[in-house]
């Protein structure tokens, strides 16, 4: 006696939700919810998001994009992936410069700036690694230099000149003045 | 010649603490940047936290941000780890590792912590 | 976070052989890679960084190459001690070591 009924619509699972009336499929990634479906089950209106603005969840109910964010040009910050309908401009360090945390207690997220790598041969210093932060990561003395407490003395040139023990050892020299 | 000793691993309750040192010797801690790393029982390496050469920054992993401390004493020039509101999911091997331009050159033995009811 | 996939998880090998270890990054990490090796019951060690360079004291047997995403390290003829779980390990953001590759006796 009674009408067919519609098709049940439990709204479990990740891919519907109730939205108004009915239970609807989410939109994709990269869209933006414009209009619930109209009947049970049924696909939501999707729109792509505008530009300079993401998604990056799958069937989700969200009705509007989330704006990309800009890289912070003050902290020297550049975009190593633009943004997308999809994704978030991914903001990072240009080469030769590398990634110091902003705030003292760091996690992956936190706002950081962009710190140049550290020129060992201004500290007379043999580059060990590509992108040093540190005067510890740089190689031992450059020729004509030795060590003298942290850092690289350069070697006298003349006989006029201090040489301790290790200034001889590394300087050439062959007595000790 | 360096050399890391870590200490002050054991058992303990879900939701307890444990204080784990790291002895260094053969070079300064205040003159390089020091990690924490952990390996539960069978499994990979995680990068637990990490204090900078100056002391002034700490990191932390997401899983431990919140719970964990990383410390120093230089005039001991020993490492610390404080570890509160322990989860089962924090048992494994603990060794710390003095850093090479984020890499990690010299580490400990390791000291196993083991959280169980 | 960068996500490191090691392959192959076990590699069966006879010493004198080659091995060929990969890493592959979930995204660019220039040349900002390690490798590590650590032997049961013991700390791992440092042996290859910055993709290409040798470590202190490690044998010019092992070797690195690669930059971006794809990274190899290359053990040009095992030894019996070289058996052992390998891992690579970025520094370009952030920390994170690969799952490892175990290189066992065939």
């Known amino acids: 006696q009674g009408g067919t009924r519609s098709p049940r619509c439990d709204c479990a699972g990740d891919f519907h939700k109730k939205i108004g009336l009915f239970c609807c499929r989410g939109c994709p990634a990269g869209h933006y919810l414009k209009a619930p479906c109209t009947e049970p089950c049924g696909n939501s209106t999707c729109l792509v998001c505008p530009q300079d603005t993401f998604l990056a969840w799958e069937n989700h109910h969200n009705s509007e994009c989330a704006r990309c964010q800009a890289c912070d040009e003050q902290a020297s910050q550049v975009a190593l992936e633009n943004c997308s309908a999809v994704a978030d401009t991914r903001c990072g360090c240009k080469p030769g410069w590398f990634v110091e945390c902003q705030v003292s207690q760091c996690v992956s997220s936190s706002p950081f700036y962009c710190q140049p790598c550290l020129d060992c041969g201004a500290l007379h210093r043999h580059t060990r690694l590509l992108c040093s932060r540190r005067d510890t990561d740089c190689g031992t003395c450059l020729p004509g230099f030795y060590e003298h407490g942290d850092g690289c003395v350069s070697c006298p040139t003349s006989t006029l000149g201090s040489c301790p023990e290790r200034c001889a050892a590394v300087c050439g020299w062959r007595q000790m003045f | 010649e360096v050399q890391l000793l870590e200490s002050g691993g054991g058992l303990v309750q879900p939701g307890g603490s444990l204080r784990l040192s790291c002895a260094a010797s053969?070079?300064?801690?205040?003159?390089?940047?020091m990690s924490w790393v952990r390996q539960a029982p069978g499994k990979g390496l995680e990068w637990v936290s990490a204090?900078?050469?100056?002391?002034?920054?700490?990191y932390y992993a997401d899983s431990v941000m919140g719970r964990f401390t990383i410390s120093r004493d230089t005039s001991k020039n020993t490492l610390y780890l404080q570890m509160n509101s322990l989860r089962a999911e924090d048992t494994a091997v603990y060794f710390c590792?003095?850093?090479?331009?984020?890499?990690?050159?010299?580490w400990g033995q390791g000291t196993l912590v083991t959280v169980s009811s | 976070e960068i996500v490191l996939t090691q392959s192959p998880a076990t590699l069966s090998l006879s010493p004198g052989e080659r091995a060929t270890l990969s890493c592959r990054a979930s995204?660019?990490?220039?040349?900002?890679l390690a490798w590590y090796q650590q032997k049961p019951g013991q700390a791992p060690r440092l042996l290859i960084y910055?993709?290409?360079n040798r470590a202190t004291g490690i044998p010019a047997r092992f070797s690195g190459s690669g930059s971006g995403t794809d990274f190899t390290l290359t053990i040009s003829s095992l030894e019996p001690e070289d058996f052992a779980v390998y891992y690579c390990?970025?520094?370009?953001?952030?920390?994170?070591f690969g799952q490892g590759t175990k290189v066992e006796i065939k």
């Open positions: 053969g070079f300064t801690v205040s003159r390089y940047a």
């Open positions: 910055d993709a290409s």
């Open positions: 590792a003095k850093e090479f331009g984020d890499y990690l050159d010299y």
């Open positions: 995204q660019s990490v220039s040349s900002y």
């Open positions: 390990q970025q520094r370009s953001n952030w920390w994170t």
């Open positions: 204090i900078s050469d100056s002391g002034g920054r700490t």
